[in-house]
């Protein structure tokens, strides 16, 4: 999948654009908003009726090298009595993010953008029930 | 930057860290081509903490379209289909990396940007405190 070129008429390519070899693009990996601290709701993963755990995946040839993945703790959901209710389902919620992959071909190195699907948490859903003949 | 394992036979001058600026192939390696969450599942409607999806579009960003979740209710849907306000619908937020055109409007020059998106909602049992 290619990154679309800027096609809007009011987006005239400025003179200041850096020269880029064909088939590639220039990417600055100094992240905008890198140090912005987000106030996330504390402990929602353990207070949710569809609780989840986190696992950190590490890959030194990826930027960022750390990606956190969530896994639902239960198949069902936790009811008001704190028991698992199998008539409901805990399901993962996923979101795509971009990473930069570094590839070694002999002694030369190339960089590739990659979309990664991250499981960010879980939600409790009513299952769709089908009765099979 | 992050340390990269080097092929032992390569010259020592190779930088172990990711350089600040890299040239990247225009093709994105990706098997997950469906970026519209409405098409990928109907969890947003079937959840006990349902949410609406709002389209956020920015031509200076890749991907230019990002879907933002907004919880439909303050509480959660109970077994009778009513909203139970003793429970909370809470957004699940995630920091993701996107590409920002830099300088602006340039077709093939980008910078990574970290943004916070609400991906969906989950139902939470709050701990209750009675304020004296």
């Amino acid at each position: 999948r290619k990154i679309p070129k800027v096609g809007h008429t009011f987006f005239q390519k400025p003179e200041s654009c850096p020269p880029v070899p064909g088939g590639s693009m220039k990417l600055d990996i100094g992240i905008i908003n890198e140090n912005q601290r987000v106030s996330m709701s504390r402990n929602i993963e353990s207070r949710s009726t569809s609780p989840w755990n986190y696992t950190v995946t590490w890959d030194p040839n990826r930027y960022p090298s750390e990606v956190v993945q969530a896994q639902c703790r239960n198949l069902g959901c936790i009811n008001a009595q704190g028991k698992e209710d199998i008539s409901m389902n805990s399901v993962p919620i996923q979101q795509e993010t971009l990473v930069v992959r570094r590839k070694h071909q002999g002694c030369s190195v190339s960089f590739q953008l990659e979309k990664v699907l991250v499981t960010v948490g879980c939600t409790c859903v009513t299952p769709v029930i089908h009765h099979v003949q | 930057g992050i340390t990269i394992p080097r092929n032992p036979g390569c010259p020592n001058s190779e930088d172990k860290n990711f350089p600040r600026t890299v040239m990247v192939n225009l093709n994105i390696h990706n098997r997950n081509t469906n970026t519209n969450p409405k098409r990928s599942s109907d969890y947003y409607n079937r959840s006990t903490s349902p949410w609406n999806l709002h389209r956020n579009e920015d031509p200076e960003r890749y991907p230019s379209v990002i879907w933002e979740a907004k919880c439909r209710h303050l509480g959660c849907i109970n077994a009778d289909g009513n909203v139970d306000y003793h429970m909370n619908s809470v957004p699940i937020q995630q920091e993701i990396l996107v590409l920002r055109r830099e300088p602006p409007h340039c077709p093939n020059s980008f910078r990574l940007e970290k943004i916070l998106v609400s991906v969906g909602c989950t139902c939470v049992t709050p701990i209750v405190h009675h304020v004296a």
């Epitope: 709701s41 402990n43 | 909370n88 939470v124 709050p126 009675h130 304020v131």
Partner: nanobody
Framework: EVQLVESGGGSVQAGDSLRLSCAAS????????FGWFRQTPGKEREFVAG????????EYANSVKGRFTISRDNAKNTVDLQMDSLKPEDTAVYYC?????????WGQGTQVTVSS
């Protein structure tokens, strides 16, 4: 620690109006929503109205829709409940609720009495 100060309760005639206020102080950061429940003797506390902090989305119990209006002041961490066209069945103790997603704080309550 979080403090909630409720005010504005009292006794009125049916058809009159009252305005309840609730101010939060202390470590009231990351507010999810702010609102009001009410309780009459022998009954469970019921939700009246709530306002989400991030986008001012409001929700009301069917019994008060069109008569009650909830509003907030972000800068002051306050929420107001404007109660119009009051009915005798609105008589209850009204509790302010501050919700921080995983933790919820209840105020001490303020009495509202509506006589016919």
């Amino acid at each position: 620690e979080v403090q909630l100060v409720e005010s504005g309760g009292g006794s009125v005639q049916a058809g009159d109006s009252l305005r309840l206020s609730c101010a939060a102080s202390g470590r009231a950061s990351s507010i999810n929503w702010f609102g009001w429940f009410r309780q009459t003797p022998g009954k469970e506390r019921e939700f009246v109205a709530g306002i989400r902090w991030s986008d001012a989305y409001t929700e009301y119990a069917n019994s008060v829709k069109g008569r009650f209006t909830i509003s907030r002041d972000n800068a002051k961490n306050t929420v107001d409940l404007q109660m119009d066209s009051l009915k005798p069945e609105d008589t209850a103790v009204y509790y302010c609720v501050l919700d921080l997603s995983t933790v919820r704080y209840w105020g001490q309550g303020t009495q509202v009495t509506v006589s016919s």
